[in-house]
């Protein structure tokens, strides 16, 4: 947020950009939590996002019996390698096709066992509210799935019907990493020592980090014809004074006519 | 990338024989898999027999067991398959079907790289 300054008091308000402001020979480059001229003032929101998607990712392992592990399994970029990549990506693509958030998969390392396929099974999801629960009910499809397809894709007489065949035993989960995002503690941390005054309010699903100086949420502060500003002490009314009315109170709710005070001062004088 | 040409096929009497060939190139490696595939009219792909070319397995379909002869010449990169007692029913397609892999899958969608095929009919 910038404010820019003409004429001779320029260089003054140079050096006296205030919250780590910097003069850049105009005005003001204020941090993201300030603007005014001086960066003397807090913003009432600040962005948080969120991501467009939150991702998860699984650790898995299966056996692959149809196919006989060589040593050219180890080399990423061997032709063996490259085409036992394609094979499985396909057959997974099958078992998950019926996930809408399942995205593919990635092997990480192929070693003997008939071929043990350490790979990562990739979610992804839209960004709602409850990104977690539809992650968590992935990630329980997706189990189910693998349990599933390498329970039945078995070799019969040592020999595989299938795209691929399994050893049943060979499938486990080994972990689970689902992207975090927290849109609570994203707004505390950017609001930095404003921390405590900042709140997320959702609407649309989507997160907003306010504070009470913010209108139109449901904790907006209401300062009637004042101004509404952050201190460290949170947030307060400033209070205007008309050419007909002083206004006071904690939301400046209080108008005193000044003819009345003017008329009672002149009745003592 | 892997290439397949085919050749051998053409019309025979039934009891008759005939032998297909193969001709490979693209590998990197001289260790891999090679198979015949057939498709009669109207009829799924179907495994006839399959050979890894380093001579650990080869497998025959239960319906050309004990006529059909499955071989590998490594020296000239080359798959044939000789085809003796050739029956009505062995009318088909032949495909020539390899994988860099040694596979042990008699499913057609296992095997990347395809022929043109060479067609084989048995018919008095």
């Known amino acids: 947020r910038t404010t820019t300054c003409f004429g001779d008091g320029c260089q003054n308000t140079a050096s006296r950009c205030k919250n780590g402001g910097t003069w850049d020979g105009l005005k003001c480059q204020c941090p993201n939590l300030y603007y005014g001229e001086l960066c003397e003032e807090v913003v009432s929101s600040i962005d948080i996002g969120p991501p467009e998607t939150i991702s998860a990712q699984m650790e898995l392992t299966v056996t692959v019996t149809s196919v006989k592990f060589t040593e050219e399994l180890k080399n990423h970029s061997s032709q063996e390698f490259q085409e036992f990549k394609q094979t499985f990506t396909e057959q997974m693509n099958i078992v998950y096709s019926g996930i809408p958030e399942y995205v593919g998969v990635n092997i990480t390392k192929l070693r003997l066992g008939s071929v043990v396929v350490e790979h990562d099974v990739l979610l992804r999801t839209k960004y709602t509210p409850e990104y977690k629960t539809v992650l968590d009910n992935a990630t329980e499809v997706v189990k189910e799935k693998i349990t599933k397809v390498t329970t039945q894709q078995i070799m019969i007489n040592d020999i595989c019907s299938d795209m691929m065949c399994f050893n049943t035993t060979g499938t486990q989960v080994q972990n689970i990493t689902v992207t975090q995002y927290d849109p609570e503690e994203d707004c505390r941390k950017m609001a930095k020592e404003y921390g405590d005054y900042f709140v997320v309010e959702y609407r649309d699903q989507k997160p907003y980090c306010i504070s009470p100086c913010e209108p139109g949420f449901s904790v907006s502060k209401n300062c009637n014809l004042g101004k509404c500003q952050m201190s460290l002490s949170g947030p307060q009314c400033l209070c205007v004074t008309t050419e007909t009315h002083w206004y006071s109170g904690e939301t400046c709710n209080q108008g005193t006519q000044k003819s009345l005070v003017y008329g009672h001062h002149h009745h003592h004088h | 990338d892997v290439q397949l040409v085919e050749s051998g096929g053409g019309v025979v009497q039934p009891g008759g024989s005939l032998r297909l060939s193969c001709a490979a190139s693209g590998y990197t490696s001289n260790r891999y898999s090679m198979a015949w595939f057939r498709q009669a009219p109207g009829k799924e792909r179907e495994v006839v027999a399959f050979i890894w070319t380093d001579g650990g397995r080869t497998y025959y379909a239960d319906s050309v067991k004990g006529r059909f002869t499955i071989s590998h010449d490594n020296s000239k990169n080359t798959l044939y398959l000789q085809m003796n007692s050739l029956r009505a029913e062995d009318t088909a397609v032949y495909y020539c079907?390899?994988?860099?892999?040694?596979?042990?899958?008699?499913?057609?969608?296992?095997?990347?790289?395809w022929g043109q095929g060479t067609m084989v009919t048995v018919s008095s």
């Open positions: 079907a390899a994988s860099s892999l040694l596979l042990q899958t008699i499913n057609p969608r296992a095997w990347p790289y």
